[in-house]
């Protein structure tokens, strides 16, 4: 029954984490006008992976999509890759996870077949988590570098006479939701893990077979193996999945300060 | 047809509060924002401040401490309350629809306000 | 606040003629998001509120008779009327439409002989 829950709130955790990554990607506010300490405009800008938006305080706003390719930035493209693949490998853990499930039966599916699909999906569900993590991440890295490069030269004098202003960008909604969706999979997947350990078939155990040998009569037997989990004893891998649970937990780590303007 | 009529007490005295009130139709308040601005006689234009489709407001710094904008959505109606008047309050007080680029696409005929004892 | 300068504060042509009124603003009024400026124009005729020509620096809003144009980037911009008619008698006003408080210029009057 544990087991069945575990499996069923994996999924369902890694579903909204999968979701969330989605709507990121999809969002365009990756990145917004920072208003602090910036004089005040009645335009306010925000871009996203795929186009940039300026919204006007009368209510208009104009999206242009980046029609170019070549023309962006390398960077802005390792994060588009990286969500998109974080989103393909998302969905086809999704599809796998379906299958997989203690509840829906379908013909005659051994426990191992459902044992395997679960941990793939789970695997897959951790490596879409950290790419949606990573993608967002560097593309936070790029906001910081580029917002203190342009407070260091916020004002650009033309012979003392004109100024000019340049726009400051800091983070955007985003790329919180990407953080926290990233989380969500992530754990969705180490959830799927652990249910796989419990989906595994129990130990089968052999008739001892008896083996004489001039004189000496020596048992042997063999001890029972998880199939294709590669794992040892059910009890020890417990422990090493509770305290991976732990370590999860911990180590998902939130932004402190929400920069929204 | 879109159309603004600013409507005001026409005279004020000295140190007395001002309540124009701008009744718009052939647009909704929930889609644009409207702007005040005046015009002294013989002068120039200036900007007063303005409210938003959300409800939001910008004012004049200069003005701020004695401006106030408000709206009523479901009566199409925009109202400026400014303080404190003196006589170089005397103008002609506008209000704008905003369109696009945050400009003044519809202005009302205006409402002469006269600062006096 | 931002200070619009515009030149010369008054002009007068005979029609026909082309006229070109300048406008000049303290800061940039171009928005790196969208590379528009955002200045406009307005006329004022004698005894009417004043009336929207040009957004955008060089979008002339629907009506306006194609000879008002709009041009000009950054910091400089121009208003030109390529064939001055009677009717143009009027004030010209430019304002900043990017930065808090929207400020106007002080106008250019346009009067014909």
């Known amino acids: 029954m544990a087991v069945t829950a575990c499996q069923g709130l994996g999924f369902v955790v890694s579903l909204i984490g999968i979701a969330g990554i989605i709507a990121a990607t999809c969002m365009d506010q990756w990145s917004t006008q920072d208003l602090y300490n910036n004089p005040v405009t009645a335009v306010f800008n925000y871009q996203g992976l795929w186009r940039s938006c300026v919204r006007e305080s009368s209510g208009f706003t104009e999206c242009r999509g980046y029609f170019t390719l070549l023309g962006l930035p390398a960077m802005l493209q390792a994060v588009r890759a990286l969500m998109i693949v974080g989103i393909v490998l998302g969905a086809i853990g999704l599809l796998v996870s379906i299958f997989a499930l203690k509840c829906i039966r379908i013909g005659s599916m051994e426990d191992s077949a459902k044992a395997n699909m679960t941990l793939t999906s789970g695997i897959m569900f951790i490596v879409s988590g950290l790419c949606a993590i990573a993608g967002v991440s560097v593309f936070a890295n790029m906001l910081v570098t580029n917002f203190w490069m342009s407070t260091a030269n916020m004002y650009t004098g033309m012979g003392g006479m004109v100024q000019t202003v340049q726009t400051r960008y800091t983070f955007g909604a985003a790329l919180f939701v990407g953080w926290v969706a990233g989380g969500l999979t992530l754990i969705g997947g180490v959830m799927m893990c652990i249910a796989c350990r419990g989906l595994a078939p129990e130990e089968t155990n052999y008739k001892a077979v008896s083996y004489h040998a001039s004189g000496h009569s020596v048992a042997y037997k063999p001890g029972g193996f998880k199939a294709s989990t590669g794992f040892g004893s059910n009890t020890k891998n417990k422990k090493i999945y509770d305290g991976g649970a732990r370590t999860e937990d911990e180590v998902q780590s939130y932004p402190s300060k929400h920069d929204y303007v | 047809e879109v159309q603004l009529k600013e409507s005001g007490p026409g005279l004020v005295a000295p140190s007395q509060s001002l309540s124009i009130t701008c009744t718009v139709s052939g647009f909704s308040l929930t889609n644009y924002g409207v702007s005040w601005i005046r015009q002294p006689p013989g002068k120039g234009l200036e900007w007063l401040g303005a409210i938003w489709a959300g409800g939001n407001t910008n004012y004049n710094s200069a003005l701020m401490s004695r401006l106030s904008i408000r709206k009523d959505n479901s009566k199409s109606q925009v109202f400026l309350k400014m303080n404190s008047l003196q006589t170089d309050d005397t103008a002609m007080y506008y209000c704008a629809r905003v369109g696009y680029g945050n400009s003044f696409a519809n202005w009302g005929q205006g409402t002469l306000v006269t600062v006096s004892a | 606040d931002i200070v619009m300068t515009q030149s010369p504060s008054s002009l007068t042509v005979t029609a026909g003629e082309k006229v070109t009124l300048s406008c000049k603003s303290s800061?940039?009024?171009?928005?790196?998001?969208?590379?528009?400026?955002?200045l406009t124009w307005y006329q004022q005729k004698p005894g009417q509120p004043p009336k929207l020509l040009i957004y955008?620096?060089?979008t002339r809003e629907s009506g306006v008779p194609d000879r008002f144009t709009g041009s000009g980037s950054g910091t400089d911009f121009t208003l030109t009327i390529s064939s001055v008619q009677a009717e143009d008698l009027a004030v010209y006003y430019c304002q900043n439409n990017y930065f808090y408080p929207l400020t106007f210029g002080a106008g250019t009057r346009l009067e014909i002989k």
């Open positions: 800061q940039t009024l171009l928005n790196s998001g969208n590379q528009k400026n955002y």
């Open positions: 955008w620096a060089s």
